[in-house]
C-alpha cells in the first residue's frame, strides 16, 4: 500500500566502520524523497536527514551517544513536494532496517604502523591509536579507549629476503620482538576483534620496512 | 555449528604429492586463521605451519618448508595443504585446527584429521 | 624457535587422585600457552588457553597456572573419562610449539 507514485525504500543496509555509520537504502528516488529515523529498543524516534534525495543517511552522531546499544533505523518515503500525504493506512510508507549494534558490528578501519625502533636484536612496533567520532567528557575517544582489551593487534613480520610471515599478538599498541641481527624485517598490522564472531579483523595496515622513513635504529 | 573436516589422505609413494583439503562450516575462515597439524604414528603434535586466508600470509616449520605450500579458497570456505616431494617421515594423520587470534591464539575447533602413508 | 619441555611424560593415577603436569618454555612467553587433550583415535580439544582460563563446556576440576617460564594442568579429581595424553602448546612466536605429551594411564 501508499500514496501514488511513492515506493518503499528497499535493501537497508548498515555501513560503518570504527563507528562511522551511514545508513544506505534503495531506490535512488523518482518523484519522491526520504526521512529518516533512528531508535534504540527502548528509546523514542529521532528523525533525521528531512526529506533528502539522497539514499544514505549518516546515523553517526546518534549511534556514537552508546555504541553498545542496538539501534533500529526506518526509512520514510515521502513523495516530492508533497510531504503531508499519507499512505493509504493513513501514515507515510516506510521501510524498517535490521537491527545495528555498534560495538559489535562496526568494521575495524585500516590500522597504521606510527612508528617502529629497533633496539639491537629487538624491535619496536608501535600501532597508531586511531581516533574515533565517539566522545566522552568533549574528548574523542581513540580505538582502544572504546574497545579496551577487546582489541588486539597482530603483527606480521618477516625478513625481506623470505616469504614467511611471522606473527606476534598485543592487547596494547606496541609490540617488542626478537629480530636477527644485520636482517632487515618488513611488518603489516591487522586490528582484530576475537570475541565477534563476524567482522572480527581490519584489512591489512600498508607494509612498513625498516630502512625507510618510519624506523629508528640504535645500537 | 562450527567443523572443520579434512579430506584427501591416502598411501603415496617416496617423492610423491598429494593435496588435504579442509572444508570449513560455521564460520568464515578469512576471519581466522587456519593451522596444520600433524602426528606421526605414535608420537606427539608437530604445527606444519598456518594461513591468514584474509591476506594469504603463510609460515612454515622448517621440516616442511619448500616441500609443503598451504592456500585457501574464501569462496568455498576451504583451507589446503598441498604436500610436493614426500617422505616417509611425512607419514602422520594431518590435522587442520582454527586458530580464535586471541593473544594467546589456542586452536579453538580441529577437524578430525586424515591419515597420509608415506610408502613404497 | 622455543621449546616447550613437558613432565612427566607418562604417569600412572587412579581415579579421585590429584594430578600435575607441567611445561617449561625455553623462554618467556607470556601467558601465551594452552593445554589439550588427546584420546586415542581422536584429535585434541582445547582446555586451557591463556594459561590459566577454562575454555568453555571443560570441567572445573582442570586448572591452569603459571609461574614464569613454568606452566602447570591441574586435574583436582582424576574421573574415568581423564585419561588420555595431555599437551601445552605455546603460541607467543611463530612457530607455535608443542610439548612432548604426558600420557595420564590408570594405575
Known amino acids: 500500500s501508499g500514496t501514488t507514485n511513492t515506493v518503499a525504500a528497499y535493501n537497508l543496509t548498515w555501513k560503518s566502520t570504527n563507528f562511522k555509520t551511514i545508513l544506505e537504502w534503495e531506490p535512488k528516488p523518482v518523484n519522491q524523497v526520504y526521512t529518516v529515523q533512528i531508535s534504540t529498543k527502548s528509546g523514542d524516534w529521532k528523525s533525521k536527514c528531512f526529506y533528502t534525495t539522497d539514499t544514505e543517511c549518516d546515523l553517526t552522531d546518534e549511534i556514537v551517544k552508546d555504541v553498545k546499544q542496538t539501534y533500529l533505523a526506518r526509512v520514510f518515503s515521502y513523495p516530492a513536494g508533497n510531504v503531508e500525504s499519507t499512505g493509504s493506512a493513513g501514515e507515510p510508507l516506510y521501510e524498517n532496517s535490521p537491527e545495528f549494534t555498534p560495538y559489535l558490528e562496526t568494521n575495524l578501519g585500516q590500522p597504521t604502523i606510527q612508528s617502529f625502533e629497533q633496539v639491537g636484536t629487538k624491535v619496536n612496533v608501535t600501532v597508531e591509536d586511531e581516533r574515533t567520532l565517539v566522545r566522552r567528557n568533549n574528548t574523542f575517544l581513540s580505538l582502544r579507549d572504546v574497545f579496551g582489551k577487546d582489541l588486539i593487534y597482530t603483527l606480521y613480520y618477516w625478513k625481506s629476503s623470505s616469504s614467511g610471515k611471522k606473527t606476534a599478538k598485543t592487547n596494547t599498541n606496541e609490540f617488542l620482538i626478537d629480530v636477527d641481527k644485520g636482517e632487515n624485517y618488513c611488518f603489516s598490522v591487522q586490528a582484530v576483534i576475537p570475541s565477534r564472531t563476524v567482522n572480527r579483523k581490519s584489512t591489512d595496515s600498508p607494509v612498513e620496512c625498516m630502512g625507510q622513513e618510519k624506523g629508528e635504529f640504535r645500537e | 555449528e562450527v567443523q572443520l573436516v579434512e579430506s584427501g589422505g591416502g598411501l603415496v609413494q617416496p617423492g610423491g604429492s598429494l593435496r588435504l583439503s579442509c572444508a570449513a562450516s560455521g564460520f568464515n575462515i578469512s576471519d581466522y586463521n587456519i593451522h596444520w597439524v600433524r602426528q606421526a604414528p605414535g608420537k606427539g603434535l608437530e604445527w606444519v605451519g598456518y594461513?591468514?586466508?584474509?591476506?594469504?600470509?603463510?609460515y612454515y616449520a622448517d621440516s616442511v618448508k619448500g616441500r609443503f605450500t598451504i592456500s585457501a579458497d574464501t569462496s568455498k570456505n576451504t583451507a589446503y595443504l598441498q604436500m610436493n616431494s614426500l617422505r616417509a617421515e611425512d607419514t602422520a594423520v594431518y590435522y587442520c585446527a582454527r586458530d580464535d587470534q586471541s593473544v594467546s591464539s589456542p586452536f579453538d575447533y580441529w577437524g578430525q584429521g586424515t591419515l597420509v602413508t608415506v610408502s613404497s | 624457535d622455543i621449546q616447550m619441555t613437558q613432565s612427566p611424560s607418562s604417569l600412572s593415577a587412579s581415579v579421585g587422585d590429584r594430578v600435575t603436569i607441567t611445561c617449561r618454555a625455553s623462554q618467556d612467553v607470556n601467558t601465551a600457552v594452552a593445554w589439550y587433550q588427546q584420546k586415542p583415535g581422536k584429535a585434541p580439544k582445547l582446555l586451557i588457553y591463556?594459561?590459566?582460563f577454562l575454555y568453555s563446556g571443560v570441567p572445573s576440576r582442570f586448572s591452569g597456572s603459571r609461574s614464569g617460564t613454568d606452566f602447570t594442568l591441574t586435574i583436582s579429581s582424576l574421573q574415568p573419562e581423564d585419561f588420555a595424553t595431555y599437551y601445552c602448546?605455546?603460541?607467543?612466536?611463530?612457530?607455535?610449539?608443542f610439548g612432548q605429551g604426558t600420557k595420564v594411564e590408570i594405575k
Open positions: 591463556s594459561a590459566s
Open positions: 602448546q605455546q603460541h607467543y612466536t611463530t612457530p607455535p610449539t
Open positions: 594461513i591468514d586466508p584474509s591476506n594469504g600470509y603463510t
